[in-house]
């Protein structure tokens, strides 16, 4: 806390300008009126205040707005945002996307801080859902944002927002998250033609069920191995050799290099060796000829 001291004669600030950078902390406290600061917040970012001076300015705003800052002030916080705690931010009601963008810009290039996470949480909760414009903004600043959400949180993403998602935004998503996002993407892109649809849906396929993979295998999509390796193992296992061959097209040769890795390894174990041999890739580990394959999971389901 800065002690309350009288402002020296002639030092009372009439406006927020560069002359204030020469004020000591106690002078800023004594000579800058909080209401003046609030109305001229847009000037603060244009003045090279030190961290210590920003502390004083924050203190003044806190005294003026003990219940939380109005959005007109929040939008112009600039570097002062770095001084805010999550507790401060929880008092705010941020509704404008422009305000959100302005504050994210301050933290640009740095890891998502607890302050930023709190800000985003407040903003999204205030909007009720993660709409396209918000998602666009968040993934522009934090490409991994989508994958930081829980499956429950992702369930509030409307299918229309999926258009804003870029492949790199899904890089760190796990299967549980893709399970939620895939049906939304399927819905969002449903009116696209075959090849365009595949380009858009490709990054979401880690959440695709077997029947959708079977359908894709009929469309000459030529899925690359990187995408195939990210598919759900349980979705890949029921695919026949012919279906995988059609799904991968010319990329089928890549199976050999991946034969020891999931899901390829587990898929090989489920195929007849005869069928694998038709690929001419030298894949080994299939079911030998003459063996009967019992699908016990089907038997359990029937009983």
């Amino acid at each position: 806390e800065v002690e309350k001291t009288a402002c020296p004669s002639g030092k009372k600030a009439r406006e927020i300008d560069e002359s204030l950078i020469f004020y000591k902390k106690w002078e800023l406290e004594a000579c800058v009126d909080a209401a003046l600061l609030a109305t001229q917040m847009d000037r603060v970012n244009a003045i090279p205040f030190t961290y210590e001076q920003l502390d004083v300015l924050k203190h003044k705003l806190d005294e003026l707005y003990p219940q939380g800052y109005p959005e007109s002030v929040i939008q112009h916080l600039g570097y002062l945002f770095l001084k805010m705690s999550p507790e401060d931010i929880r008092k705010w009601n941020v509704t404008s996307l422009e305000t959100l963008k302005a504050l994210l810009e301050v933290n640009k290039g740095h890891e998502m801080s607890p302050q930023v996470a709190t800000l985003i949480d407040r903003f999204v909760k205030g909007r009720g859902q993660l709409d396209k414009d918000t998602l666009d903004t968040l993934t522009a600043f934090y490409p991994g944002y989508l994958c930081s959400l829980s499956p429950e949180e992702l369930s509030s993403v409307p299918p229309s927002s999926i258009w804003a998602v870029r492949p790199q935004d899904l890089d760190t998503c796990d299967p549980r998250q893709l399970d939620v996002l895939y049906p939304k993407a399927r819905l969002a892109f449903q009116n696209m033609n075959g090849s365009e649809y595949f380009v858009k849906i490709q990054s979401f396929l880690g959440g695709a069920p077997t029947e959708d993979l079977k359908a894709l295998s009929q469309q000459n999509v030529s899925m690359d191995l990187a995408t195939f390796m990210k598919l759900r193992t349980d979705a890949v296992l029921p695919l026949t050799v012919a279906e995988v061959q059609k799904l991968l097209g010319p990329h089928v040769e890549g199976l050999k290099a991946e034969e020891r890795h999931r899901p390829v390894r587990d898929w090989i174990l489920r195929q007849r060796q005869d069928d694998l041999d038709t690929l001419g890739l030298g894949l080994q580990g299939g079911i030998p000829n003459g063996y009967l394959v019992l699908d016990l999971s089907m038997q359990e389901a029937l009983s």
Epitope: N45, A46, P48, F49, G109, H110
Partner: nanobody, 122 residues
Framework: EVQLVESGGGLVQAGGALRLSCAAS????????MGWFRQAPGKEREFVAA????????YYADSVKGRFTISKDNAKNTVYLQMSSLKPEDTAVYYC???????????????WGQGTQVTVSS
């Protein structure tokens, strides 16, 4: 790792000009305000100029105002200090530094270059 590399220093006659450059990594450059400081022998490090990442605002120390110009090239991730009408008292090691905020205080700058010597002879 953050790296700031200055260049362009040298020996120049009073009244002459020099242009200092400071190359930064793309990440540092896009997420930081950049400043120039100088330190003469036996003296404290002194603020020279800064350029604000947000809004591009610029601030100069009174001692260099009207003579020095700070600028940046986003495509090259480089900040410059164009120095003209140089005086013997401008002799110092010039440092480039980056900060998360737009500040005139050396304490607020996290990363520093190795410095480049500027000598102005009379």
């Amino acid at each position: 790792e953050v790296q700031l590399v200055e260049s362009g220093g040298g020996l120049v006659q009073a009244g002459g000009a020099l242009r200092l450059s400071c190359a930064a990594s793309e990440r540092t450059f896009s997420s930081s305000s950049m400043g120039w400081f100088r330190q003469a022998p036996g003296k404290e490090r002194e603020f020279v100029a800064a350029i604000n990442r947000i809004g591009g605002h610029i601030y100069y120390a009174d001692s260099v105002k009207g003579r020095f110009t700070i600028s940046k090239d986003n495509a090259k991730n480089t900040v410059y200090l164009q120095m003209s009408s140089l005086k013997p008292e401008d002799t110092a090691v010039y440092y480039c530094a980056s900060s998360r905020i737009y500040s005139h205080s050396a304490r607020d700058y996290d990363y520093w270059g190795q410095g480049t010597q500027v000598t102005v002879s009379s």
